[in-house]
């Protein structure tokens, strides 16, 4: 199930500046992102910005700058004109629409005890998806087997045995870091980062994101829309998400150049994947 995370932070240099970061984790392509404050989109919230992956962005005061950070995450800078900093107690919501599959929305606010500039993402939680856990388990078994073989070889040193040549797999490493999204109902979490190194391409996961980001879900509000939408129980615990970084893809903070309809925007481990162009009314 696709999920959304939200993080709100106050800028260290300007106490009146806030930044909202939102991200989408899951399969499917994003057709529109809506950022609102004061509540969810369509439930009393006021829209601050709308971002389209191809056509650009639209924003309304007090939004200062809305931009794509990666293929599946955005940031919105806000300028607080008032001295009382109303943003500090405001809920910000991000809605990722994938037409016609569905839309997913999650909300967050500035942590109550956050010092300026120190509102980094909450402490990560080491939670793995079931398929990754299975792979790690298998890796453990293989490692144990290798260790056992080495043990046997050491025991039989007196016998002339051919030296085993280790095979080196030159495949990319997948690093997954689990973070907790900023949500109003979220309690503080105090666990170290969970780092996973495997030797397979993330696109080979059964629910890999078309952009190459593996879908490692987080808890968020899911509003299924359209016949293709189906809700399933997230495997991860409530309030956690995992971002997958991969060297094949565009560097964080960059956005791939607009290539137009029908061209490959994002690389895929299995080879080029055509991204459907915009379907405008002309």
């Amino acid at each position: 199930t696709p999920e959304v995370w939200v993080q709100v932070q106050m800028e260290a240099t300007e106490l009146s500046s806030f930044t909202v970061h939102c991200g989408f984790l899951g399969p499917g392509s994003i057709s529109l992102v809506t950022v609102s404050w004061g509540g969810p989109d369509g439930a009393g919230g006021t829209k601050l910005a709308v971002l389209h992956p191809e056509l650009g962005t639209r924003q309304w005061a007090p939004a200062r700058q809305a931009r794509w950070e990666t293929q599946s995450s955005i940031s919105l800078a806000l300028e607080d004109s008032g001295a009382s900093s109303p943003f500090a107690n405001t809920t910000f919501c991000c809605k990722f629409a994938s037409f016609p599959e569905g839309s997913w929305e999650s909300c967050g606010s500035l942590p109550p005890s956050s010092d300026p500039g120190l509102s980094a993402p909450p402490t990560p939680v080491p939670i793995l998806r079931a398929d990754l856990a299975g792979i790690l388990g298998l890796s453990g078994v293989l490692l144990f087997g290798c260790g056992y073989l080495l043990h046997l070889l050491r025991r039989q040193k007196h016998r002339p045995t051919p030296r085993l040549q280790p095979s080196h797999t030159n495949s990319q490493a997948l690093t997954a870091q689990a973070w907790a999204p900023s949500q109003a109902s979220q309690a503080a979490l105090h666990d170290p980062y969970a780092t996973i190194n495997t030797s397979f391409c993330p696109a080979t996961l059964d629910t890999a994101h078309p952009n190459g980001w593996a879908s490692l879900p987080t808890h968020a509000a899911h509003q299924p829309q359209g016949p293709a939408a189906s809700a399933s129980t997230p495997i991860l615990a409530r309030g956690s998400f995992v971002s997958v970084e991969n060297g094949l893809y565009t560097q964080a903070g960059e956005r791939p150049p607009h290539t137009g309809p029908g061209l490959t925007l994002f690389p895929d481990c299995r080879g080029p994947r055509a991204v459907e162009g915009r379907f405008g009314v002309r």
Partner: nanobody
Framework: EVQLVESGGGLVQPGGSLRLSCAAS????????MGWFRQAPGKGLEGVAH???????RYVDSVKGRFTISRDNAKNSLYLQMNSLRAEDTAVYYC???????????????WGQGTMVTVSS
């Protein structure tokens, strides 16, 4: 919460007519277009028609002169009158509410479950 419910789909013979309706509720500020998209079996999505906040209708070339989009603000409803239907008009039709990034495109932010239109003899 924004809710869009389409109705009026069904089976019709080539050359026939159908009128699709969309009942909308839960609107918020800063939504500036309403329209219809369709998805034919095994094909991609296509914007059929939309109305801007200023009431100007826009159509995809393939339906110009055959389809008419209209809205009733008092009833919070959107309509699509489809005449001279062809087999290639067979699709699931979605009512959408969205945002304009240029004149020709209403980017969907909310949509309904869709209603099936089948044109066949």
């Amino acid at each position: 919460e924004v809710q869009l419910v389409e109705s009026g789909g069904g089976l019709v013979q080539p050359g026939g007519s159908l009128r699709l309706s969309c009942a909308a509720s839960g609107f918020t500020s800063r939504t500036d277009c309403m329209g219809w998209f369709r998805q034919a079996p095994g094909k991609g999505l296509e914007g059929v028609a939309h109305i801007d906040s200023d009431g100007i209708p826009r159509y995809v070339d393939s339906v110009k002169g055959r389809f008419t989009i209209s809205r009733d603000n008092a009833k919070n409803s959107l309509y699509l009158q489809m005449n001279s239907l062809r087999a290639e008009d067979t699709a699931v039709y979605y009512c959408v509410v969205g945002f304009k990034f240029d004149e020709d495109y209403c980017a969907p932010n909310d949509w309904g479950q869709g209603t099936m239109v089948t044109v066949s003899s």
